[in-house]
């Protein structure tokens, strides 16, 4: 069997002039090619591998949300000589002019790898875009984390950073087929230069409250004593629990997964979700 | 019908500069990768420059690395060549050239470049 | 130099078979890229004729073939035809010089 073979960082690697084929060893009878595309709402980008596969022939397409961050998976296994190019890998920034210009921002600015590779995704070197609220959603925390993307014994990754609806997820992922998108949310503009070592906290652990000095009950005494609690005091309000600093209660992402009844798009940004903002 | 008009090209002395646009239509061009491709009079095809859809993937040939700048507008559909530093043998027609699904399915009419004193 | 030799030209007569070749080296055609092969007219901009070692893209005769084999490539043009006199060029991306490379052009003559 012969297959395309390809490896595709973002916009680069797979391009239709830099198109190899392979032949397969004997016994691999189908060709692979995944495409992971990640959609932030200031940019999409994708992942792809095409090569010599194994299993069975046949598709598997899955759509992801992980705090407002959008992946969409396409693998597709075929028994044909090089059978395994049907997929569109092209990836574009989403257009601003449909998008973020014409919503305000919200104060919040994260840093913003799209595409980027690891080297340019470094610390405080990114760009920096301004966080703005999309589809009835709050975009107000910054995201820090990773997508990879394996198929054809080769594994792929990217860094990824970005506006997101969560301020305080703590290594939060989720998985499709071959795919994973992981990373760390935090609270305050610029905030995500590097969560890799974020450390988790319960949430059930409420935050610590410093309480104002009791009022001195003699006029003689000459000192006047603080007092803090030597254990956590739940605040007494029924409504909202007061906002924990982001290094002490950050709450636990939970996964989601939109199962997608349409074949996800993936030119310029994936399907039913071209502009973010409305 | 997809179509790629270049123009901008002309007589330059060597050391000077110009920019060549290519007006793209009948596609969607945000999508598309694109090249600039030239051919001295007389002579072969020489790739100079490519560009990805998004424009953060850029590639040279080595004898233009440098001078030459390549770049596009996707919400006007064109592609761009900023030339400096020429030198006589950049003197070729220069044609633009969209990557379709497979290699360069179309090109433009050629816009000319002449270097010389 | 042309990182990609073709013969600079062949000629044949009408209804004849000519074969164009094309040799490369391990940075490209034997790394694996495929080739594509390109026609171009007197006079006119370059079409794409071959992609993919030895697909045509819709339009293109069935007259035209191209094989791919280790470091070299070949175009195949059966029948020959008056029409077909022009210059014919392979092309693959290169490891080494990082962008597509083409071959040196064979300027095809029929003869007769």
């Known amino acids: 069997l012969e297959c395309y073979s390809c490896v595709q960082k973002a916009d680069d690697g797979c391009s239709p002039n830099k198109m190899k084929t392979v032949k397969c060893a004997p016994g691999v009878d189908v060709c692979t090619e995944a495409v992971g595309a990640v959609e932030t709402i200031h940019g999409q980008f994708s992942l792809a591998v095409r090569g010599c596969g194994s299993g069975l022939p046949g598709k598997n397409d899955r759509g992801l949300d992980l705090h407002g961050l959008l992946a969409f998976i396409q693998l597709q296994q075929c028994a044909q000589d090089r059978c395994n190019a049907k997929l569109n890998l092209t990836s574009r920034a989403l257009d601003p002019a449909g998008n973020e210009s014409a919503y305000p921002p919200n104060g919040v600015e994260c840093y913003s790898c799209v595409g980027l590779s690891r080297e340019a995704c470094q610390g405080t070197s990114p760009p920096v875009v301004s966080c703005y609220n999309a589809s009835d959603h709050v975009y107000k925390g910054c995201f820090d984390g990773n997508v990879t993307l394996t198929a054809a014994n080769v594994t792929v990754s990217l860094p990824v950073r970005g506006c997101v609806q969560d301020e305080f997820c703590t290594r939060d992922g989720v998985t499709g087929p071959g795919f994973t998108l992981s990373g760390s949310c935090c609270q305050g503009s610029r905030c995500n230069s590097d969560l890799r070592n974020k450390t988790y906290f319960s949430p059930r652990i409420p935050p610590l409250v410093r309480l104002p000095p009791p009022e001195p009950t003699t006029v003689a005494s000459t000192t006047s004593v603080t007092t803090s609690t030597s254990a956590p005091v739940r605040p007494t309000s029924t409504t909202k629990p007061m906002p924990a600093p982001t290094s002490q209660t950050p709450r636990q992402g939970v996964e989601h997964e939109a199962s997608r009844d349409e074949e996800p798009r993936l030119t310029g940004g994936a399907a039913g979700h071209q502009d973010r903002s409305n | 019908e997809v179509q790629l008009l270049e123009s901008g090209g002309g007589l330059v002395q060597p050391g000077g500069s110009l920019r060549l646009s290519c007006a793209a239509s009948g596609f969607t061009f945000s999508n598309a990768w694109m090249s600039w491709v030239r051919q001295a009079p007389g002579k072969g095809l020489e790739w100079v420059s490519y560009?990805?859809?998004?424009?953060?993937?850029?590639y040279y040939a080595d004898s233009v690395k440098g001078r030459f700048t390549i770049s596009r507008d996707n919400s006007k559909n064109t592609l761009y060549l900023q030339m400096n530093s020429l030198r006589a043998e950049d003197t070729a027609v220069y044609y633009c050239a969209r990557e379709g699904l497979w290699a360069f399915d179309y090109w433009g009419q050629g816009t000319l470049v002449t270097v010389t004193s | 130099q042309s990182v990609l030799t073709q013969p600079p030209s062949a000629s044949g007569t009408p209804g004849q078979r000519v074969t164009i070749s094309c040799t490369g080296s391990s940075s490209n055609i034997g790394a694996g890229y495929v080739v594509h092969w390109y026609q171009q007219l007197p006079g006119t901009a370059p079409k794409l004729l071959i992609y993919?070692?030895?697909q045509r893209p819709s339009g293109v005769p069935d007259r035209f073939s191209g094989s791919k084999s280790g470091t070299s490539a070949s175009l195949a043009i059966s029948g020959l035809r008056s029409e077909d006199e022009a210059d014919y060029y392979c092309a693959a991306w290169d490891d080494r010089l990082n962008g597509p490379v083409f071959g040196g052009g064979t300027k095809l003559t029929v003869l007769g």
């Open positions: 560009i990805s859809s998004s424009g953060s993937t850029i």
């Open positions: 993919d070692n030895n």
